[in-house]
């Protein structure tokens, strides 16, 4: 899995008038990391693990970046001609990634009232627009605004790409938290399914990094993909992740089944409780 930094900013308008302030969240490696506190006008870490990433450093740089980005997005919303009465939102999601081979990706996505209408591969400058006519109209509107000051926006987006990657590298280099290995806690449970069958569920929790293999085996052989149900690998709020896998088996055959887990080069097997 690549390391990633994801900015999610939203600005609002009411009856065509852009509202002051903005909403902002930042995710690091898929985990809630920062949010913008509108009362205090500051970027604040989301939980202890986020504080641990930067140690005792202040969040001034993050506050400055988010404030600048919020201002830019408000200006963009002001130039959308489509705004009718009522409440409307413009959301910008920016993601940069560093992959294992050190290659990078950087993308930007705009949503109006929750609908994606414009994306850009920031590195190559390729724009993509969904097929719908509304998306096409909105995209043309926003791109024309961005082109009005082409040199500024060109500099802005390249700086944005560089800044995102620079911040991500800074977090990765300064943080023991992001280089750590936390093995999962694995727990197997069973529940009655239907006559003669039981559902067995294998849960892995509190692990880092995110990459994990979790699968059911029968007599030491992995079950086929379509006989298992997998949960998403989700952040648990503590800077670690959780997931699960379940399958249905015949009652009385429990001893033939084990849950196999592989994480960060370590693996283990876990029997079904009797």
């Amino acid at each position: 899995e690549p390391h990633s930094l994801r900015y999610n900013l939203t600005v609002l308008s009411w009856d065509g008038s852009v509202q002051s302030g903005f909403l902002a969240e930042v995710h690091l490696d898929g985990q809630p990391f920062l949010r913008y506190d509108r009362q205090k006008c500051r970027a604040k870490p989301q939980g202890q693990w986020a504080e641990d990433v930067l140690g005792n450093k202040t969040w001034d740089r993050e506050t400055r970046d988010l404030t600048g980005n919020g201002k830019d997005l408000r200006m963009t919303l002001a130039h959308i001609k489509d705004q009718k009465e009522g409440l409307h939102s413009l959301q910008e999601i920016r993601v940069c990634e560093i992959h294992e081979d050190n290659s990078t990706r950087s993308s930007q996505h705009f949503y109006y009232d929750g609908e994606l209408f414009l994306s850009q591969n920031v590195e190559t400058e390729e724009w993509t627009v969904p097929q719908s006519s509304r998306a096409q109209t909105l995209a043309m509107n926003v791109r024309n605004f961005l082109k009005e000051d082409a040199m500024k926006t060109k500099t802005h987006y390249h700086a944005m790409h560089a800044d995102c990657l620079q911040e991500l590298r800074r977090y990765l280099e300064s943080s023991v938290v992001l280089r750590r290995r936390v093995p999962p806690m694995v727990n197997v449970t069973r529940s009655e399914a239907s006559e003669g069958n039981i559902t067995v569920t294998c849960r892995a929790s509190s692990f880092y990094p995110r990459n994990i293999t979790l699968t059911w085996r029968q007599d030491g052989v992995s079950l086929s993909h379509d006989t298992q149900q997998w949960g998403d690998v989700l952040p648990d709020g503590n800077g670690t992740y959780q997931t699960w896998v379940a399958t249905r088996i015949c009652q009385g055959e429990e001893q033939r089944f084990t849950c196999y887990m592989e994480h960060s080069g370590n693996h283990s097997t876990h029997p079904v409780p009797s």
Epitope: P2, H99, S103, S107, N121, T124, E125, E126
Partner: antibody
Framework: QVQLQESGPGLVKPSETLSLTCTVS?????????WNWIRQPPGKGLEWMGF???????KYNPSLKSRVTISRDTSKNQFSLKLSSVTAADTAVYYC????????WGQGTTVTVSS | EIVLTQSPATLSLSPGERATLSCSAT???????FHWYQQKPGQAPRLLIY???NLASGIPARFSGSGSGTDYTLTISSLEPEDVAVYYC?????????FGQGTKLEIK
């Protein structure tokens, strides 16, 4: 209809600079897209050399970066390639192409590097 | 850089047969930045399929594309003699843009 046409000398001496121009008709190079140079040595595959984007940004293949320059002349709706210090290994068919998924191509021009 | 490896290098099939060409990447590619090209002898390449699965203008429906992540496939459902060509995959996710080495399709 969008058309691209490469032009330039077909023979270049070793150590000299190869210069090619792509003339675009039917679309403004400042409207959108990347405007690319791609080459193909005889009997070999395709190699992307670089592009100039609609905004004027240039990107190059790191394998050629120190030798390649791509520029544009917006008044003529043209973009150009310069490749310095050429050797026989630069003998190829040179194509200009539009986009990121290259949807329009020139017909290609053969450049031979030989003394 | 992202290296694309195409297989097989050469494919020899009879008219009417189904052709499957593969392209494997060393790093994950966004499917909207993955494309296929056809190059016939003495001609410039032409865009065949863009963004993994969309047919370019004028391309017959017997051509289709699929894939995600690091593995992509071009399928020709029923080969025609005019499909003799070299087929290239290409990624536009990161700079430098790269092509596969090509698969040569021959008709028996």
């Amino acid at each position: 209809q969008v058309q691209l046409q490469e032009s330039g000398p077909g023979l270049v001496k070793p150590s000299e600079t190869l210069s090619l121009t792509c003339t675009v008709s039917g679309y403004s190079i400042t409207s959108d897209y990347a405007w690319n140079w791609i080459r193909q040595p005889p009997g070999k595959g395709l190699e992307w050399m670089g592009f100039v984007s609609y905004s004027g940004t240039t990107k190059y293949n790191p394998s050629l970066k120190s030798r390649v320059t791509i520029s544009r002349d917006t008044s003529k709706n043209q973009f150009s390639l310069k490749l310095s210090s050429v050797t026989a290994a630069d003998t190829a068919v040179y194509y200009c192409a539009r986009g990121y998924g290259f949807d329009y191509w020139g017909q290609g021009t053969t450049v031979t590097v030989s003394s | 850089e992202i290296v694309l490896t195409q297989s097989p290098a050469t494919l020899s099939l009879s008219p009417g047969e189904r052709a499957t060409l593969s392209c494997s990447a060393t790093s994950s590619i966004s499917s909207i930045y993955f494309h296929w090209y056809q190059q016939k002898p003495g001609q410039a390449p032409r865009l065949l399929i863009y963004r993994t699965s969309n047919l370019a203008s004028g391309i017959p429906a017997r051509f289709s594309g699929s894939g995600s992540g690091t593995d992509y496939t071009l399928t020709i459902s029923s080969l025609e003699p005019e499909d003799v060509a070299v087929y290239y995959c290409q990624q536009g996710t990161t700079i430098p843009f790269t092509f596969g080495q090509g698969t040569k399709l021959e008709i028996k």
